[in-house]
Protein backbone atom coordinates (compact mmCIF):
# COMPACT_ATOMS: atom_id res chain seq x y z
CA UNK A 1 0.00 0.00 0.00
CA UNK A 2 1.21 3.50 -0.76
CA UNK A 3 1.72 5.89 2.22
CA UNK A 4 -1.29 7.96 1.02
CA UNK A 5 -3.55 4.93 1.04
CA UNK A 6 -2.30 3.88 4.46
CA UNK A 7 -3.07 7.33 5.89
CA UNK A 8 -6.54 7.25 4.24
CA UNK A 9 -7.31 3.86 5.80
CA UNK A 10 -6.19 5.13 9.25
CA UNK A 11 -8.44 8.18 8.94
CA UNK A 12 -11.39 6.12 7.65
CA UNK A 13 -11.36 3.62 10.52
CA UNK A 14 -10.83 6.28 13.19
CA UNK A 15 -13.86 6.95 15.43
CA UNK A 16 -13.23 10.70 15.40
CA UNK A 17 -13.67 10.72 11.62
CA UNK A 18 -17.16 9.20 11.96
CA UNK A 19 -17.97 11.69 14.70
CA UNK A 20 -16.82 14.61 12.53
CA UNK A 21 -18.99 13.49 9.61
CA UNK A 22 -21.99 12.93 11.87
CA UNK A 23 -21.65 16.37 13.45
CA UNK A 24 -21.23 17.94 10.00
CA UNK A 25 -24.42 16.29 8.72
CA UNK A 26 -26.44 17.33 11.77
CA UNK A 27 -25.14 20.91 11.61
CA UNK A 28 -25.90 20.99 7.89
CA UNK A 29 -29.46 19.87 8.63
CA UNK A 30 -29.86 22.69 11.15
CA UNK A 31 -28.65 25.22 8.58
CA UNK A 32 -31.08 23.79 5.99
CA UNK A 33 -34.01 24.54 8.29
CA UNK A 34 -33.30 28.28 8.19
CA UNK A 35 -36.04 30.32 6.52
CA UNK A 36 -33.98 33.34 5.48
CA UNK A 37 -30.34 32.35 5.99
CA UNK A 38 -27.84 35.23 6.34
CA UNK A 39 -25.14 35.76 3.71
CA UNK A 40 -22.35 34.19 5.80
CA UNK A 41 -24.11 30.78 5.61
CA UNK A 42 -22.90 30.57 2.00
CA UNK A 43 -19.35 30.12 3.29
CA UNK A 44 -20.58 27.51 5.79
CA UNK A 45 -22.23 25.73 2.85
CA UNK A 46 -18.87 25.60 1.07
CA UNK A 47 -17.28 24.21 4.24
CA UNK A 48 -19.84 21.41 4.38
CA UNK A 49 -19.26 20.58 0.72
CA UNK A 50 -15.52 20.56 1.39
CA UNK A 51 -15.91 18.14 4.33
CA UNK A 52 -18.13 15.81 2.26
CA UNK A 53 -15.61 15.95 -0.58
CA UNK A 54 -12.79 15.17 1.86
CA UNK A 55 -14.79 12.22 3.26
CA UNK A 56 -15.38 10.80 -0.21
CA UNK A 57 -11.73 11.30 -1.23
CA UNK A 58 -10.57 9.45 1.90
CA UNK A 59 -12.97 6.58 1.09
CA UNK A 60 -11.84 6.46 -2.56
CA UNK A 61 -8.14 6.51 -1.63
CA UNK A 62 -8.65 3.85 1.04
CA UNK A 63 -10.89 1.51 -0.93
CA UNK A 64 -10.44 2.39 -4.58
CA UNK A 65 -13.04 4.02 -6.82
CA UNK A 66 -14.99 1.32 -8.69
CA UNK A 67 -12.71 -1.53 -9.85
CA UNK A 68 -12.71 -4.37 -7.34
CA UNK A 69 -15.21 -5.88 -4.94
CA UNK A 70 -15.07 -3.53 -1.93
CA UNK A 71 -14.41 -0.26 -3.74
CA UNK A 72 -16.21 3.07 -3.17
CA UNK A 73 -18.96 2.76 -5.78
CA UNK A 74 -19.69 -0.90 -4.99
CA UNK A 75 -21.30 0.17 -1.72
CA UNK A 76 -24.83 1.57 -2.39
CA UNK A 77 -24.49 3.92 0.63
CA UNK A 78 -21.63 5.66 -1.13
CA UNK A 79 -23.83 6.32 -4.17
CA UNK A 80 -25.76 8.71 -1.93
CA UNK A 81 -22.55 10.49 -0.90
CA UNK A 82 -21.47 10.72 -4.52
CA UNK A 83 -24.84 12.17 -5.63
CA UNK A 84 -24.78 14.71 -2.77
CA UNK A 85 -21.32 15.96 -3.82
CA UNK A 86 -22.14 16.02 -7.55
CA UNK A 87 -25.28 18.10 -6.93
CA UNK A 88 -23.42 20.40 -4.53
CA UNK A 89 -20.92 21.30 -7.26
CA UNK A 90 -23.58 21.38 -9.98
CA UNK A 91 -25.77 23.91 -8.16
CA UNK A 92 -22.77 26.03 -7.20
CA UNK A 93 -20.60 26.21 -10.29
CA UNK A 94 -22.82 25.31 -13.27
CA UNK A 95 -25.36 27.88 -14.46
CA UNK A 96 -28.51 25.85 -15.08
CA UNK A 97 -31.07 28.63 -15.14
CA UNK A 98 -33.75 27.70 -12.62
CA UNK A 99 -31.74 25.71 -10.08
CA UNK A 100 -34.46 25.63 -7.41
CA UNK A 101 -35.34 22.08 -8.46
CA UNK A 102 -31.70 21.03 -8.16
CA UNK A 103 -31.41 22.72 -4.78
CA UNK A 104 -34.06 20.28 -3.57
CA UNK A 105 -31.40 17.57 -3.79
CA UNK A 106 -29.55 19.25 -0.92
CA UNK A 107 -32.10 17.53 1.31
CA UNK A 108 -30.36 14.25 0.39
CA UNK A 109 -27.58 15.36 2.74
CA UNK A 110 -29.89 14.57 5.65
CA UNK A 111 -30.04 10.98 4.38
CA UNK A 112 -26.28 10.70 4.88
CA UNK A 113 -27.14 10.33 8.58
CA UNK A 114 -28.39 6.82 7.79
CA UNK A 115 -25.01 5.64 6.53
CA UNK A 116 -23.25 7.04 9.62
CA UNK A 117 -25.59 5.75 12.38
CA UNK A 118 -25.39 1.91 12.55
CA UNK A 119 -28.89 1.40 14.02
CA UNK A 120 -30.48 3.45 11.28
CA UNK A 121 -28.49 1.52 8.68
CA UNK A 122 -30.01 -1.74 9.98
CA UNK A 123 -33.57 -0.37 9.90
CA UNK A 124 -33.22 1.05 6.38
CA UNK A 125 -31.55 -2.16 5.25
CA UNK A 126 -34.52 -4.11 6.63
CA UNK A 127 -36.86 -1.71 4.87
CA UNK A 128 -35.14 -2.26 1.52
CA UNK A 129 -35.10 -6.03 2.05
CA UNK A 130 -38.77 -6.02 3.01
CA UNK A 131 -39.65 -4.12 -0.18
CA UNK A 132 -37.95 -6.89 -2.18
CA UNK A 133 -39.81 -9.55 -0.22
CA UNK A 134 -43.09 -7.62 -0.43
CA UNK A 135 -43.33 -7.96 -4.21
CA UNK A 136 -45.33 -11.21 -3.98
CA UNK A 137 -47.62 -9.85 -1.25
CA UNK A 138 -48.13 -6.65 -3.28
CA UNK A 139 -49.10 -8.68 -6.36
CA UNK A 140 -51.59 -10.62 -4.22
CA UNK A 141 -52.94 -7.38 -2.70
CA UNK A 142 -53.37 -5.65 -6.07
CA UNK A 143 -55.01 -8.79 -7.46
CA UNK A 144 -57.47 -9.01 -4.55
CA UNK A 145 -58.24 -5.28 -4.74
CA UNK A 146 -58.79 -5.57 -8.50
CA UNK A 147 -61.19 -8.50 -8.11
CA UNK A 148 -63.23 -6.69 -5.45
CA UNK A 149 -63.07 -3.44 -7.43
CA UNK A 150 -64.64 -5.27 -10.39
CA UNK A 151 -67.33 -6.72 -8.12
CA UNK A 152 -67.96 -3.25 -6.65
CA UNK A 153 -68.11 -1.82 -10.16
CA UNK A 154 -70.85 -4.30 -11.12
CA UNK A 155 -72.81 -3.88 -7.90
CA UNK A 156 -72.62 -0.15 -7.26
CA UNK A 157 -71.90 1.58 -10.58
CA UNK A 158 -73.77 4.90 -10.60
CA UNK A 159 -75.49 4.21 -7.28
CA UNK A 160 -73.83 7.07 -5.43
CA UNK A 161 -75.43 9.54 -7.85
CA UNK A 162 -78.87 8.77 -6.39
CA UNK A 163 -80.26 11.87 -4.70
CA UNK A 164 -83.47 13.05 -3.10
CA UNK A 165 -85.00 15.54 -5.51
CA UNK A 166 -87.78 17.99 -4.65
CA UNK A 167 -91.13 16.97 -6.09
CA UNK A 168 -92.98 20.27 -5.97
CA UNK A 169 -91.48 22.07 -8.94
CA UNK A 170 -92.82 25.16 -10.66
CA UNK A 171 -95.27 24.32 -13.43
CA UNK A 172 -92.78 24.91 -16.24
CA UNK A 173 -89.72 23.37 -14.53
CA UNK A 174 -88.36 19.95 -15.43
CA UNK A 175 -85.46 17.93 -14.02
CA UNK A 176 -83.37 18.74 -17.09
CA UNK A 177 -84.14 22.47 -17.10
CA UNK A 178 -83.15 22.66 -13.44
CA UNK A 179 -79.91 20.73 -13.90
CA UNK A 180 -78.96 23.07 -16.76
CA UNK A 181 -79.41 26.17 -14.61
CA UNK A 182 -77.95 24.89 -11.32
CA UNK A 183 -74.73 26.71 -10.55
CA UNK A 184 -74.14 27.43 -6.90
CA UNK A 185 -74.35 25.22 -3.82
CA UNK A 186 -77.36 27.32 -2.81
CA UNK A 187 -79.20 26.30 -6.01
CA UNK A 188 -78.56 22.65 -5.28
CA UNK A 189 -79.92 22.96 -1.76
CA UNK A 190 -83.10 24.44 -3.24
CA UNK A 191 -83.91 21.30 -5.23
CA UNK A 192 -82.16 18.46 -3.40
CA UNK A 193 -82.58 17.28 0.18
CA UNK A 194 -79.61 17.95 2.47
CA UNK A 195 -79.25 16.74 6.03
CA UNK A 196 -78.19 19.48 8.43
CA UNK A 197 -74.45 20.04 8.26
CA UNK A 198 -74.03 17.80 5.23
CA UNK A 199 -72.13 18.96 2.16
CA UNK A 200 -73.75 16.37 -0.11
CA UNK A 201 -77.37 15.75 -1.05
CA UNK A 202 -79.07 12.91 0.83
CA UNK A 203 -78.45 9.58 -0.87
CA UNK A 204 -81.30 7.22 -1.63
CA UNK A 205 -81.99 3.99 -3.46
CA UNK A 206 -84.61 2.11 -5.42
CA UNK A 207 -84.58 -1.19 -3.53
CA UNK A 208 -86.82 -1.77 -0.53
CA UNK A 209 -83.93 -1.93 1.97
CA UNK A 210 -82.10 1.13 0.65
CA UNK A 211 -82.44 4.68 1.96
CA UNK A 212 -85.76 6.38 1.27
CA UNK A 213 -86.41 10.05 0.65
CA UNK A 214 -88.42 12.21 3.04
CA UNK A 215 -91.92 13.37 2.11
CA UNK A 216 -91.98 15.79 -0.80
CA UNK A 217 -88.85 14.33 -2.37
CA UNK A 218 -88.28 11.57 -4.89
CA UNK A 219 -85.19 9.50 -5.61
CA UNK A 220 -83.45 10.31 -8.90
CA UNK A 221 -80.08 9.51 -10.42
CA UNK A 222 -78.53 12.80 -11.42
CA UNK A 223 -75.55 15.08 -10.87
CA UNK A 224 -72.16 14.18 -9.47
CA UNK A 225 -70.94 11.69 -6.91
CA UNK A 226 -70.43 12.55 -3.22
CA UNK A 227 -67.26 14.13 -1.81
CA UNK A 228 -66.72 16.43 -4.81
CA UNK A 229 -67.06 13.46 -7.16
CA UNK A 230 -64.20 11.47 -5.64
CA UNK A 231 -66.30 8.76 -4.00
CA UNK A 232 -67.80 6.37 -6.54
CA UNK A 233 -67.74 2.95 -8.14
CA UNK A 234 -68.41 4.35 -11.64
CA UNK A 235 -65.11 3.29 -13.22
CA UNK A 236 -62.57 0.61 -12.37
CA UNK A 237 -60.05 3.21 -11.15
CA UNK A 238 -62.53 4.90 -8.78
CA UNK A 239 -63.72 1.50 -7.57
CA UNK A 240 -60.10 0.48 -6.97
CA UNK A 241 -59.52 3.66 -4.96
CA UNK A 242 -62.66 2.96 -2.90
CA UNK A 243 -61.41 -0.58 -2.20
CA UNK A 244 -57.98 0.74 -1.24
CA UNK A 245 -59.79 3.07 1.16
CA UNK A 246 -61.58 0.08 2.70
CA UNK A 247 -58.34 -1.86 2.98
CA UNK A 248 -56.54 0.99 4.75
CA UNK A 249 -59.72 1.80 6.74
CA UNK A 250 -59.49 5.44 5.70
CA UNK A 251 -62.88 6.84 6.86
CA UNK A 252 -64.28 3.62 5.45
CA UNK A 253 -67.45 3.75 7.57
CA UNK A 254 -68.61 6.79 5.59
CA UNK A 255 -68.16 4.95 2.27
CA UNK A 256 -69.94 1.95 3.82
CA UNK A 257 -72.91 4.08 4.96
CA UNK A 258 -73.15 5.94 1.64
CA UNK A 259 -73.11 2.73 -0.40
CA UNK A 260 -75.58 0.89 1.84
CA UNK A 261 -77.96 3.85 1.72
CA UNK A 262 -77.81 3.95 -2.08
CA UNK A 263 -77.73 0.21 -2.81
CA UNK A 264 -79.37 -1.53 0.12
CA UNK A 265 -78.43 -3.10 3.45
CA UNK A 266 -77.94 -6.54 1.87
CA UNK A 267 -74.64 -5.36 0.43
CA UNK A 268 -73.08 -5.18 3.89
CA UNK A 269 -71.87 -8.73 3.10
CA UNK A 270 -69.56 -7.23 0.44
CA UNK A 271 -68.05 -4.85 2.99
CA UNK A 272 -67.67 -7.55 5.65
CA UNK A 273 -65.72 -9.74 3.19
CA UNK A 274 -63.54 -6.84 2.00
CA UNK A 275 -62.73 -5.66 5.53
CA UNK A 276 -61.91 -9.17 6.76
CA UNK A 277 -59.86 -10.12 3.72
CA UNK A 278 -58.34 -6.80 2.77
CA UNK A 279 -58.00 -4.96 6.02
CA UNK A 280 -57.39 -7.72 8.53
CA UNK A 281 -55.63 -10.40 6.49
CA UNK A 282 -53.66 -8.59 3.77
CA UNK A 283 -52.48 -5.68 5.93
CA UNK A 284 -51.24 -8.12 8.60
CA UNK A 285 -49.59 -10.24 5.91
CA UNK A 286 -47.66 -7.14 4.78
CA UNK A 287 -46.67 -6.40 8.40
CA UNK A 288 -45.54 -10.01 8.87
CA UNK A 289 -43.26 -9.81 5.82
CA UNK A 290 -41.74 -6.53 7.08
CA UNK A 291 -41.20 -8.06 10.54
CA UNK A 292 -39.54 -11.14 9.00
CA UNK A 293 -37.25 -8.99 6.87
CA UNK A 294 -36.22 -6.94 9.91
CA UNK A 295 -35.52 -10.07 11.91
CA UNK A 296 -33.34 -11.45 9.10
CA UNK A 297 -31.45 -8.15 8.83
CA UNK A 298 -30.77 -8.14 12.59
CA UNK A 299 -29.35 -11.65 12.42
Amino acid sequence: FSPLRRISIKILVHSLFSMLIMCTILTNCIFMTMNNPPDWTKNVEYTFTGIYTFESLVKILARGFCVGEFTFLRDPWNWLDFVVIVFAYLTEFVNLGNVSALRTFRVLRALKTISVIPGLKTIVGALIQSVKKLSDVMILTVFCLSVFALIGLQLFMGNLKHKCFRNSLENNETLESIMNTLESEEDFRKYFYYLEGSKDALLCGFSTDSGQCPEGYTCVKIGRNPDYGYTSFDTFSWAFLALFRLMTQDYWENLYQQTLRAAGKTYMIFFVVVIFLGSFYLINLILAVVAMAYEEQNQ
Epitope: S168, T174, L175, E176, F206, G216, T218, C219, V220, K221
Partner: nanobody, 124 residues
Framework: EVQLVESGGGVVQPGGSLRLSCAAS????????MRWYRQAPGKQREFVAR???????GYADSVKGRFTISRDNAKNTVYLQMNSLRPEDTALYYC??????????????????WGQGTLVTVSS
Protein backbone atom coordinates in the same frame (compact mmCIF):
# COMPACT_ATOMS: atom_id res chain seq x y z
CA GLU B 1 -86.92 2.55 -23.19
CA VAL B 2 -89.54 4.45 -21.17
CA GLN B 3 -92.79 5.32 -22.94
CA LEU B 4 -95.77 7.38 -21.84
CA VAL B 5 -99.07 6.62 -23.54
CA GLU B 6 -102.16 8.83 -23.10
CA SER B 7 -105.67 7.59 -23.70
CA GLY B 8 -109.28 8.57 -22.97
CA GLY B 9 -109.57 11.60 -25.24
CA GLY B 10 -112.53 12.19 -27.53
CA VAL B 11 -115.44 14.47 -28.39
CA VAL B 12 -117.71 15.55 -25.56
CA GLN B 13 -120.51 18.08 -25.12
CA PRO B 14 -120.10 21.16 -22.86
CA GLY B 15 -120.80 20.23 -19.24
CA GLY B 16 -119.77 16.62 -19.94
CA SER B 17 -117.01 14.53 -18.41
CA LEU B 18 -113.96 12.60 -19.60
CA ARG B 19 -111.27 10.58 -17.86
CA LEU B 20 -107.79 10.70 -19.33
CA SER B 21 -105.15 8.23 -18.37
CA CYS B 22 -101.40 8.18 -18.93
CA ALA B 23 -99.55 4.90 -18.51
CA ALA B 24 -95.77 4.66 -18.22
CA SER B 25 -94.06 1.52 -19.48
CA UNK B 26 -90.50 0.26 -19.41
CA UNK B 27 -88.18 -0.99 -16.67
CA UNK B 28 -89.38 1.67 -14.25
CA UNK B 29 -87.88 1.95 -10.77
CA UNK B 30 -89.56 5.13 -9.56
CA UNK B 31 -91.91 7.78 -10.91
CA UNK B 32 -91.59 11.17 -9.24
CA UNK B 33 -94.05 13.86 -10.24
CA MET B 34 -96.56 13.35 -13.08
CA ARG B 35 -98.13 16.34 -14.80
CA TRP B 36 -100.78 17.08 -17.38
CA TYR B 37 -100.36 19.87 -19.92
CA ARG B 38 -102.57 21.00 -22.77
CA GLN B 39 -102.07 22.87 -25.99
CA ALA B 40 -104.99 24.46 -27.81
CA PRO B 41 -104.63 25.11 -31.57
CA GLY B 42 -102.50 28.22 -32.15
CA LYS B 43 -101.76 28.66 -28.46
CA GLN B 44 -98.84 27.91 -26.15
CA ARG B 45 -98.71 24.79 -24.05
CA GLU B 46 -100.15 25.38 -20.57
CA PHE B 47 -99.95 23.48 -17.30
CA VAL B 48 -103.12 21.72 -16.13
CA ALA B 49 -102.41 19.60 -13.05
CA ARG B 50 -99.67 17.72 -11.21
CA UNK B 51 -99.28 14.94 -8.67
CA UNK B 52 -96.17 13.87 -6.77
CA UNK B 53 -95.17 10.34 -5.77
CA UNK B 54 -96.60 10.99 -2.30
CA UNK B 55 -99.88 12.11 -3.92
CA UNK B 56 -99.60 15.86 -3.29
CA UNK B 57 -101.60 17.64 -6.01
CA GLY B 58 -101.65 21.04 -7.71
CA TYR B 59 -103.91 22.60 -10.36
CA ALA B 60 -104.01 25.54 -12.76
CA ASP B 61 -106.50 28.23 -11.69
CA SER B 62 -108.61 27.66 -14.83
CA VAL B 63 -109.36 24.01 -13.95
CA LYS B 64 -109.54 24.16 -10.12
CA GLY B 65 -112.66 22.49 -8.78
CA ARG B 66 -113.48 20.85 -12.14
CA PHE B 67 -110.48 18.57 -12.77
CA THR B 68 -109.07 15.94 -10.42
CA ILE B 69 -105.67 14.29 -10.80
CA SER B 70 -104.92 10.90 -9.26
CA ARG B 71 -102.40 8.12 -9.71
CA ASP B 72 -102.01 4.38 -9.36
CA ASN B 73 -98.40 3.68 -8.38
CA ALA B 74 -98.76 -0.05 -8.87
CA LYS B 75 -99.79 0.47 -12.50
CA ASN B 76 -97.48 3.47 -13.10
CA THR B 77 -100.51 5.40 -14.32
CA VAL B 78 -101.84 8.91 -13.75
CA TYR B 79 -105.48 9.88 -14.33
CA LEU B 80 -107.14 13.20 -15.04
CA GLN B 81 -110.86 13.27 -14.27
CA MET B 82 -112.37 16.20 -16.18
CA ASN B 83 -115.85 17.36 -15.18
CA SER B 84 -117.96 20.33 -16.30
CA LEU B 85 -116.03 20.61 -19.53
CA ARG B 86 -116.11 23.87 -21.47
CA PRO B 87 -115.36 24.66 -25.13
CA GLU B 88 -112.11 26.41 -24.04
CA ASP B 89 -110.90 23.07 -22.65
CA THR B 90 -110.55 21.84 -26.24
CA ALA B 91 -106.87 20.96 -26.70
CA LEU B 92 -104.28 18.25 -27.14
CA TYR B 93 -103.57 16.92 -23.63
CA TYR B 94 -100.03 15.76 -22.87
CA CYS B 95 -98.70 13.93 -19.89
CA UNK B 96 -95.19 14.41 -18.50
CA UNK B 97 -93.40 12.36 -15.84
CA UNK B 98 -90.12 12.33 -13.96
CA UNK B 99 -89.08 8.70 -14.36
CA UNK B 100 -86.13 6.75 -13.04
CA UNK B 101 -85.70 3.58 -15.03
CA UNK B 102 -83.22 0.86 -15.78
CA UNK B 103 -81.94 1.42 -19.32
CA UNK B 104 -79.16 0.25 -21.66
CA UNK B 105 -77.77 -2.87 -20.09
CA UNK B 106 -79.04 -2.27 -16.60
CA UNK B 107 -77.71 1.25 -15.97
CA UNK B 108 -80.10 3.60 -14.19
CA UNK B 109 -81.25 6.87 -15.70
CA UNK B 110 -83.53 9.63 -14.42
CA UNK B 111 -85.24 11.98 -16.81
CA UNK B 112 -88.37 13.81 -17.89
CA UNK B 113 -90.53 11.90 -20.38
CA TRP B 114 -93.46 13.08 -22.48
CA GLY B 115 -96.38 11.32 -24.10
CA GLN B 116 -97.62 11.88 -27.65
CA GLY B 117 -100.85 13.49 -26.48
CA THR B 118 -104.58 12.72 -26.65
CA LEU B 119 -107.09 15.08 -28.23
CA VAL B 120 -110.05 16.41 -26.24
CA THR B 121 -112.76 18.26 -28.15
CA VAL B 122 -115.57 20.01 -26.28
CA SER B 123 -118.27 20.92 -28.76
CA SER B 124 -122.02 20.99 -29.00
Amino acid sequence: EVQLVESGGGVVQPGGSLRLSCAASGRILRIGYMRWYRQAPGKQREFVARITDDSATGYADSVKGRFTISRDNAKNTVYLQMNSLRPEDTALYYCEALVTASVRGGSIHSGTYWGQGTLVTVSS
